[in-house]
Amino acid sequence: DCVTKLFKDTLFQGGDISTVFTPSAEHCQVVCTHHPRCLLFTFMAESPTEDPTKWFTCVLKDSITETLPKVNMSGAISGYSFKQCPHQINACNNHLYVDLDMKGMNYKDSVAKSAHECQERCTNDIHCHFFTYATWSFPSEQHRNVCLLKYTQMGTPTRIMKINEVVSGFSLKSCALSNLACIRDIFPRTGFADSNIDSVLVPDVFVCQSICTHHPNCLFFTFLSKDWPKESERNLCLLKSSLSGLPSTRYGKDNAFSGFSLQNCRHSVPVLCHSSFYPDTDFLGEELDIVDVEGREACQKVCTDTLRCQFFTYSPSQQPSNKGNLFPSCRGKCYLKLSLNGSPTKILHGRGGISGYTLRLCKMDNVCTNRINARIVGGTASVYSEWPWQITLHTTSPTQRHLCGGSIIGNQWILTAAHCFIEVDSPKILRVYSGILNQSEIKEDTTFFGVQEIIIHDQYKMAESGYDIALLKLETTMNYTDFQRPICLPSKSDRNITYTECWVTGWGYRKLRDKIQNTLQKAKVPLITNDECQTRYTGHKITNKMVCAGYKEGGRDACKGDSGGPLSCKHKEVWYLVGITSWGEGCAQSGRPGVYTNVIEYVDWILEKTQPA
């Protein structure tokens, strides 16, 4: 069962696996959720009856029965991990903790104007886990406005002290707000020579990269595949770091793969969720249970539904068929397993097993990176949950109608086009409908999100001259589901990506004189260079803040009513919001591509406007 409630003045007795320091019970709960074995926790809040050295301790606990006896204790706050919960789990913690000094290894001090600036420095420093900032009224004059960047082996403070006039907080790398370089490439036949900070056994390089990404101090890694010559080192994922943050030496080695942590990647951090099956692979670990199931998917499901299960091996039984010959039956044994660190203690090949991991951690994913099986003039009808970031923006004045498209980019934010609001004088007349495929689904009682604020780029004059971008802040936050979830913003470090699969979607006209479509339409369109686009629109200036897409022969394009909607492009299984439908001459006219707002050029503007004040 999912229990989100925190139990005040309550201690869970026994089951201790580890003690860390956290600034709040909520943060303790997140740490517990991300720990491979933690199911419950007890946090010690500030309390006049409790020894101050015990304040802010977060005791992580496990239990075979998935619960522990509760005891009354003043100042203790207890709760359960979110592992049991179906909802999105986020490691992002943007709180600032006033009058708390989170102790760790200081490795950089500098003067900053504010705690927010200090947090930004931490977010953009490769080693920084958290920081402490002494305010302008700190008693020691020379320490005022000093920003201390800190790290620890665990990524959590080694101790937390109450000190007036200091502010502490965490790096926002896990909020996908770092400007540090994001290197997604994996380099085959390459090893990194730097010292190992840890090692785990994994079935492939992608799991290794994911584990490195979620390890507090791993910056890059080397994976030794199952064909590595030294048997004792096969399937070894070597987690590495260096002072500079980059590998000092790389060497050529067959059957070795190397790469980088994706902790700095904006909106594209993979989760500790590995959905693949690994054939002819047995995972060893502490055995939790053995269950008879039909097929590997069923085994994975049993593991996912068993709270303490971390990984599994499915062993198909070999049974004689009616014809008397041997063949693998669907039925087999499902071995549910766990370990101290969530990874197998040994990986064996050639024994016929099929192994994999629990999927319960998939909900910890950065929500925009979900892998959607993809694929409006010239478009075809979409299906449910194909474009879960697409919204329909309605105006209620003078009567209710579809006004524009838009894209979900955060749980309270829609990105759309500025020109949609030429005749909108108040956000009160706007309604955002998400998870909609057919306009006919929208009735009087259909739930919608009210709009609290319209933020139009202050340099916007008209669509054709650029800056055709606007943000809508919703009155309430959105819970993500398979039908409504955000799309990733492109990262500024990804400017060189060539997107080969782009789709424009909307309920707009299918030809110039038409009506709004009932079903969300989609059309695959190729991106074209700005130089080529400029030759098609000699009367306009195609700037680098615009991106063009369409076919020379026309036939597929966005049209009236699609405005503000997404130009979605897929790269390495992740969808990015590359453009916002903006303008064009006619619809799907030969030699007249669609012109879109180039989102990558506005990422800083978006982040600035969506940051908490």
């Epitope: 200081n106 001090d109 008693p139 960047l149 800190k150």
Partner: antibody, heavy 116, light 107 residues
Framework: QVQLEESGPGLVAPSQSLSITCTVS????????IYWVRQPPGKGLEWLGM???????DYNSALKSRLSISKDNSKSQVFLKMNSLQTDDTARYYC??????????WGQGTTLTVSS | DIVMTQSHKFMSTSVGDRVSITCKAS??????VAWYQQKPGQSPKLLIY???YRNTGVPDRFTGSGSGTDFTFTISSVQAEDLAVYYC?????????FGGGTKLERL
């Protein structure tokens, strides 16, 4: 764990210069200030100066003209240089790590005798 | 420069007594005062910083109070191992400065 260790010449003749090194381990000099403090035999503590994590320095006003503090972050070493030594500079010299202006970890100290 | 004055060079006490050592700053130092303990042949040890915050591992019989120019360090129940010299230090403004020290000795 955090450690600081001072090393110095032990004996210096009057009017000569002094150079003491403080070698630290268990933490990075880029993130902490380091202080120099001395204690003449049988007397109290005297604050000499400090070097901040970012390299800025502060000195005791009375000794400013004779003192110089520098560091090498990569070698985890801090240096105290003092010239024109007199007999009243005889003392135990300590380096200590900064914690908001207080000194949370100290070295064992090195004894300096100024004598001809 | 700020001068820190500890008016008592020596204080006599017995095990179990409550003892208070005072320190006066020549100008306002807010709450930026630290207290150290030094035993013969040893380096000083930080007990209290920013007037009242106990350093990690320091027993709770040691407390500090004050603000501005007047500061007090108190041992609520003196133990034999507490016999030592105690120094106050201002860390409000550089150059930081120490008091002359107060030696706590057996009565």
């Amino acid at each position: 764990q955090v450690q600081l260790e001072e090393s110095g010449p032990g004996l210096v003749a009057p009017s000569q210069s002094l150079s003491i090194t403080c070698t630290v381990s268990g933490f990075s000099l880029t993130g902490y200030g380091i202080y120099w403090v001395r204690q003449p035999p049988g007397k109290g503590l005297e604050w000499l100066g400090m070097i901040w994590g970012d390299g800025r320095t502060d000195y005791n006003s009375a000794l400013k003209s004779r003192l110089s503090i520098s560091k090498d972050n990569s070698k985890s070493q801090v240096f105290l240089k003092m010239n024109s030594l007199q007999t009243d500079d005889t003392a135990r010299y300590y380096c200590a790590r900064d914690y908001y202006g207080s000194k949370d970890y100290w070295g064992q100290g090195t004894t300096l005798t100024v004598s001809s | 420069d700020i001068v820190m004055t500890q008016s008592h060079k020596f204080m006599s006490t017995s095990v179990g007594d409550r003892v208070s050592i005072t320190c006066k700053a020549s100008q306002d130092v807010s709450t930026a005062v630290a207290w150290y303990q030094q035993k013969p042949g040893q380096s000083p040890k930080l007990l209290i910083y920013l007037t009242s915050y106990r350093n990690t591992g320091v027993p709770d019989r040691f407390t500090g109070s004050g603000s501005g120019t007047d500061f007090t360090f108190t041992i609520s129940s003196v133990q034999a191992e507490d016999l030592a010299v105690y120094y106050c230090q201002q860390h409000y403004k550089t150059p930081y400065s120490f008091g002359g020290g107060t030696k706590l000795e057996r009565l």
